[in-house]
Every structure is written in C-alpha cells, then in structure tokens.
C-alpha cells in the first residue's frame, strides 16, 4: 500500500521508500550484523521506515543492501534521491582506522522481478557517495539530525527493469529514504496542440523531438512540435493549431460561438456577433441566418449585414415631347442597405380604349442611356408610337432584390404621347445644275406620322457656313433653287411639316454651280 | 432546472474543504459552470469554471487556492488549505449559452473557516 | 483581466423616480456588449436581470433598462418600487475572465 506523496509535475515515481506502509523487506547481506531495518518518526511524528548500519568499529566492512525490482516504465534514464544521515567519524572516539564517511551506489538491469539473492558482481557502481553534512554526539542529544540530499543519475537502461545496491564500508549511516524516479515532459497544451506524457531522452542532453496533435475542434495551420528537453521542461514550440469555424480559443480549447455569434473561417479570430438583421440559434454557427425579409447576396461575405430590396423610387416626373419621354425620379427613402442600387425602365404599351389591356413596348423603342441598370435617376424614351398610351415603370433593384421582388420595389407613370413630326428625309437630289440654279428632288420620310403639308429647303453658299441662309418651302417633292452664284459651292437641307410640325433636316447635300448648263442627279453627297 | 451547493460547514483552516454543486433538469456535457463566491457583508467573487469538456479555468488570485471537478450530475470545488479569508457564502452557476454570463444560480452554501 | 468599476456603490431614490448605475470596464468587453446586470437582494442568490448589454432576462420588468458598449456601460431603473431595494451588481467577460463591479446598493425611500 502506497501513500501519495507530492513531487513535481514533470517527475515520475518509481519507487519511494516514505510512501511505503509497513516493513520495506529489502534484501541484506549478511543476513544479520549489517544494514538492519529500523523505523522512525519524522519530523510531522509520522513513522518511516528506514535503513541503518554503524559497524565503525569493525575493520574490513562490506555491507549490501538490495532494494525490491524497480520496474523501468520505458525510461531510459532514471534518478535516484537519498535522504540519509551519517555520523561524523572524529566524534567517535576509537574508531580512526576503522570508521568512514561515505557507502556506495549501485545498480543492476535485470528483466527478472524475483532475483533473491545479491549477487555483487552483478551491480554496476553508479557512485561514491559521501554527506555534506555530517553530525556529532552533541547533535544526537539535541535531536538535530542532519539530514542529507544526494542525487544521481543512471541510464541508458534497456532491461524491463533494475535493482538498487547499497553497499556500506564502515560508515554509521541511516537510510532515511530512497526515491527512484524518471523525469517526463508532462501532457501539455500549446497552441492549441495537444502533446502526450514524454518520457525524456537516454542522455542528459537529448532533446526528443514530439508531434503535437489538434485539440478537438481545430486543424493545424502548421505541424505543431515541441522539443522534451532532459530536465523534462518543453522547448521551442513550433506550428500551430487553429480553431475550425464556429469554434474560438478559449483557455486552450476551442470552444463552440455561442448563440448570437459566429465564425466563418478557421483563424485565430474570436468569434463575431451576428452582423445587423441576421441571428444563429444555435452554438457553433459558421454563418448567421438572415432576418425575415432580409438576404445576403452570393457574393456578399458572412461578416455582412443582410440587406433588403430597396423601397420604391420617388417622385417620378414624366415630361412628353411628342414621340418622346423623359422620366426623372429620387433615389428610394429605403435602400435596403445595400449600395448597389441600379434601376430598371419597363415599357407597356397600352390600349386606349382598355389601360388594362398592357403588352410589352418591343425593341423599336430606344433608351438613353440604357433600359436596364441605370445609374443615374433618368432616362429618355424615343421612337414611340404617337398617340399612344404608355406605362412607364421604374424598378429601384439592389444585390438581393432577386430574392424577394415586390410591386412595392416599382413606380409607375402612364403617359400618352402627342402626334409626332415627321421623320427626316434620307434622300435629295440634285436634278439639274446651272449657273445660276439647281433643281432638287427628294423622297417623302419613311416616318410621315400624318399628312405632310409642305417641305422647307433650307441652302446657304459654303463658305458662308450657314451665317447666312435662305429658305424655300413647297408642297411639291422638287424645286428649282433660281438667283444662285455661277462657280459656287451651295449646301442644301429639306424637311417635312405636318401639323405636328418640322421634322429633322436631311443630311446636307453640297452643289457647285456651273459655268455652262448641265443635267447631273445628286445623292446627298458632293455634287459638281 | 435547478442547482443546489452542499457541503459547507466550520473548518479549521488549513483543513481541505469541497463543496458539491448538483444539477437537475440539464446535462453538464452542455453546460459549463462556475463557482462564484461572496464574503459576509461584501461583493461577489468569481473563483473559476469548469468547461464542458471537463477543462478547468481560475481566476488569477484564484490559482492553486482552488480545484474544481465534475461527474455527471455535481461539480465540486475543493478549497484546497483554507484560510479564515476563505470564509464566504460560495455559489455554483451555470454559464448561458447565448451570453458570456450565469443564467442559474444556486442558492449558496456557507463556509466558515475559523480555528 | 478586465477591471469593473461600479459608481456610485450605494444610492437613495423615491418611490416612482428613477435610478442610474454605471459600470465601467478597465478595457473593452468581449464583443463590446458581453456585460450582465444581476440584482441581489440579502440572503438570496444573485438574479439576471439584463444580458448582452441591453437585453432584458426573461421577466424582467421594463422598467429595467441597459445600454452602453465597449466600456461604459449604464443600469437605469425608472419608476422604482420598494421591491426594487437591492445591490445591482455588473459582471464583465474578456479573456477567459469573469469580474463583478464591486455592486451598488439602491434604497428606496
């Protein structure tokens, strides 16, 4: 039976005498009138058992005291403590060839636990040793024993275990207590690696090299090692472990987010509070759930707020020009909370008689700058139908508004579209060149929109440019342009009006005149 | 759910003291608990905690004063030398899983250490 | 570690008035906001009465309010009652770490 003793965290017992309840029954040789166990009381009145001899008056000594089998629990080194007094041979009258003041240590590997005899030249000698302090007869009679420490080291051992050897020489010794022990690197936790029980080296200066492994719920960032140094302290660690997502470190273990929070990635990083408008119900959360209502776009990361598709736009103002619109509006009061906001146009064309009875505008209609995606808070409708219904929708969209789209994300207008001008006329002609006239022609406008009442010819000499200019309006589809300048260069433009009013001028067509009559057909372009 | 501290009495001091914390109505493997402390007539005191996995956690001032322990259903703390400043009403409580806090706490068992 | 200060560490109100305690951290709490209030009244075991800063426990009147963050953070108790008469104690988290404030004691008059 064996009571607990206190040692260092880093020391492992092998054998202690003190701890040891009843007779320790070593073996001694001789038998008898050597080492002859004694018990003690130490200085908390507990009984010990120890070993004494005192033969200092006989000459030629050779006392052996044999501890039980030791087994070496895979050390390779062990150390041995002796706590003993021993008796200062000049306080002892008559005894000056005969008494000494140290013994010896020995030891012996064996894999038998059940050797019962000593057999001397079997042991190996570990040292001489002899005590610091020594006492005297006065010491004796004040109760002061002076209790000596000494240590020694043995290995590499290699057999399943040894047997210890006292051997005495002449000297008044007291055994009070003998400790066998090894030394180990105790289970440790650093970085977040785990590493085991170490046994140290065989050598004094070894260093055993040891993987740690992850504590639950991390991974290693990058192979965590120590170092079990000899004294059985940890050195040098090196690499890492991290905690997984949804854990955090604390107090050396990684421990799950707790509701509310989260972590997204294996880092160092505590975890974060759920950001704005998302929770976690439970422990452990890599992400956090979005409110009802609210999303997080695919590309938006889990540190995010979750946002909402934005309000609709306001204050929407239409402003008609004939076939054309222009629609201006405010950025919504709620944009979700999200800064990409863009807008999208939605064109309906609608019946007179039913606004119901909406289909989509097509592709003949135009939008400046673009339909879809907007930037900016207005756009330009062209190439409308006159006369026509329209409704205009505008869509305010942000990175979630996929989601969860909603009527409450769009403003609408309709509008009806005034009769239109005519559309510009794409081909003049210069029939016949004078020197003093020309004589044009040209095709009606693809685009009329309504009954062309006459045509306007707009001409001006080149060099001019355009300062100074006449104009000649006729219902008919030619004109002789008469009173011109013989060798010069005229430019000539024609529109359509109907009672919507003027369409565009045509593209320029430039003539020279000439100094003898000829009949030359222009297209538009430069005619001589 | 409950908890309830046993085990408090008169010590001597230096004479080792544990006190038992016992839980109802939860498991201990889904909860850490603390043991949290208050002197006659003074504030509370947070001395450790006793983490899920069965790791332990002290206050500084609390180091090798203290030594928290669990089974199944108790938590123990074991005052390892007592001193007369030791004495105090100790409460054991439950750490919350939505907050960094006690959501359970037991009614206090009274440690008086005098010689 | 993080140091609790409780101010003021006692206070008198009148029935129906109101009561401000604060609370402040030597550095910021975990996740600026892991601060709890508990009130204990003589002979009993402390009770939460409000988590996460300014969320109020599970029926706790709300006439119990918390607010603040980082490391100032403030326990206003308005129309008091008698049973209101108790020490209010603030608990920070950080760094593995628990600490109470030292506690304030209310009266009510």
């Known amino acids: 039976v064996t009571g607990s003793r206190v040692y260092p965290a880093n020391e492992v017992t092998l054998l202690d005498s003190r701890s040891v309840q009843g007779e320790l029954g070593w073996i001694a040789s001789p038998l008898e009138g050597g080492w002859e166990e004694v018990s003690i009381m130490d200085e908390k009145n507990t009984p010990i058992r120890t070993y004494q001899v005192c033969n200092v008056m006989e000459p030629s000594q050779n006392n052996w005291l044999r501890t039980d089998w030791i087994t070496r629990e895979g050390a390779q080194r062990v150390y041995i403590e002796i706590k003993f007094t021993l008796r200062d041979c000049n306080s002892l009258p008559g005894v000056m060839g005969t008494c000494k003041e140290t013994f010896n240590l020995y030891y012996y590997e064996s894999d038998n636990d059940k050797e019962r005899f000593i057999r001397e030249n079997q042991f190996v000698k570990i040292d001489t040793i002899a005590a610091d302090e020594s006492f005297t007869q006065v010491d004796i009679g004040d109760r002061i024993m002076k209790l000596n420490t000494e240590i020694r080291d043995v290995g590499p051992l290699s057999k399943k275990g040894f047997y210890l050897a006292f051997q005495d020489v002449g000297a008044c010794i007291a055994l009070v207590s003998v400790r066998v022990f090894y030394k180990k690197c105790p289970l440790t936790v650093r970085n977040l690696a785990q590493f085991p029980d170490t046994i140290t080296g065989a050598d004094t200066s070894s260093l055993v090299e040891v993987r740690g492994s992850c504590v639950n719920n991390s991974e290693e960032k990058d192979v965590p090692k120590m170092y079990c140094g000899a004294d059985g302290e940890w050195l040098v660690p090196i690499g890492n472990c991290l905690c997984n997502a949804g854990h955090e470190e604390r107090s050396g273990e990684c421990q799950a987010c707790k509701i509310g929070y989260y972590k997204a990635l294996s880092t160092d990083a505590t975890c974060a509070k759920c950001p704005p408008h998302s929770y976690s119900v439970w422990e452990g959360a890599t992400s956090c759930t979005c409110d009802r209502g609210f999303f997080r776009a695919d590309n938006d990361a889990a540190s995010m707020p979750c946002t909402r598709p934005p309000s609709a736009p306001l204050n929407l103002i239409s402003n008609v020009n004939e076939t054309s619109v222009n629609l201006e509006w405010s950025s919504p009061q709620n944009t979700g909370g999200r800064q990409d906001i863009s807008y999208n146009v939605v064109c309906k064309k609608c019946g007179a008689g039913d606004p119901s009875k909406c289909r989509p505008c097509g592709s003949g209609v135009h939008y400046t700058p673009q339909q879809n995606g907007l930037k900016t808070t207005k756009v330009s409708i062209t190439d409308l139908l006159a006369h026509t219904n329209y409704t205009f929708e505008i869509w305010a969209v942000n990175g979630v508004s996929k989601y969860n789209p909603s009527p409450d994300q769009s403003v609408s207008v309709t509008v009806t579209t005034n009769q239109a001008a005519p559309s510009s006329i794409a081909l003049v002609q210069a029939k016949e060149v004078t020197r003093y006239s020309v004589a044009l022609a040209w095709l009606e406008p693809d685009r009329p929109n309504g009954v062309i009442l006459e045509y306007e010819v707009k001409y001006y000499e080149k060099d001019q440019n355009e300062r100074s200019y006449r104009i000649v309006r006729t219902a008919a589809r030619n004109t002789d342009i008469k009173g011109l300048n013989p060798l010069t260069s005229y430019v000539f433009h024609v529109r359509a009006r109907t009672a919507a009013g003027y369409g565009d001028f045509s593209e320029p067509l430039e003539v020279t005149t000439n100094t003898v009559p000829s009949r030359i057909i222009g297209d538009g372009a430069n005619s001589t | 759910q409950s908890v309830e501290e046993s085990g408090g009495r008169l010590v001597t001091p230096g004479t080792p003291l544990t006190l038992t914390c016992t839980v109802s109505?939860?498991?201990?493997?889904?909860?850490?608990m603390s043991w949290v402390r208050q002197a006659p007539g003074k504030g509370l005191e947070w001395i450790g905690i006793?983490?899920?996995?069965?790791n332990t956690y002290s206050a500084n001032w609390a180091k090798g004063r203290f030594t928290i322990s669990k089974t199944s259903t108790t938590v123990d703390l074991k005052i390892t030398s007592p001193t007369t400043e030791d004495t105090a009403t100790y409460f054991c409580?439950?750490?919350?899983?939505?907050?960094?806090?006690?959501?359970?706490w037991g009614p206090g068992t009274l440690v008086t250490v005098s010689s | 570690y993080v140091m609790m200060t409780q101010t003021p560490s006692s206070v008198s109100a009148a029935v129906g008035g109101t009561v401000t305690i604060n609370c402040q951290a030597s550095?910021?709490?975990?996740?600026?906001?892991?601060l709890a209030w508990y009130q204990q009244k003589p002979g009993q075991r402390p009770k939460l009465l409000i988590y996460?800063?300014?969320t109020l426990a599970s029926g706790v009147p709300s006439r119990f309010k918390g607010s603040g963050s980082g490391t100032e953070f403030t326990l206003t108790i308005s129309d008091l009652e008698c049973a209101d008469a108790a020490t209010y104690y603030c608990?920070?988290?950080?760094?593995?770490?628990?600490?109470f404030g030292g506690g304030t004691k209310v009266e009510i008059k």
């Open positions: 550095q910021s709490v975990y996740g600026n906001n892991e």
């Open positions: 996460r800063a300014s």
């Open positions: 006793i983490y899920r996995s069965g």
């Open positions: 109505g939860f498991s201990l493997s889904s909860y850490h």
């Open positions: 608990l920070g988290y950080k760094s593995d770490d628990y600490t």
């Open positions: 409580a439950r750490e919350s899983s939505t907050f960094y806090g006690m959501d359970l």
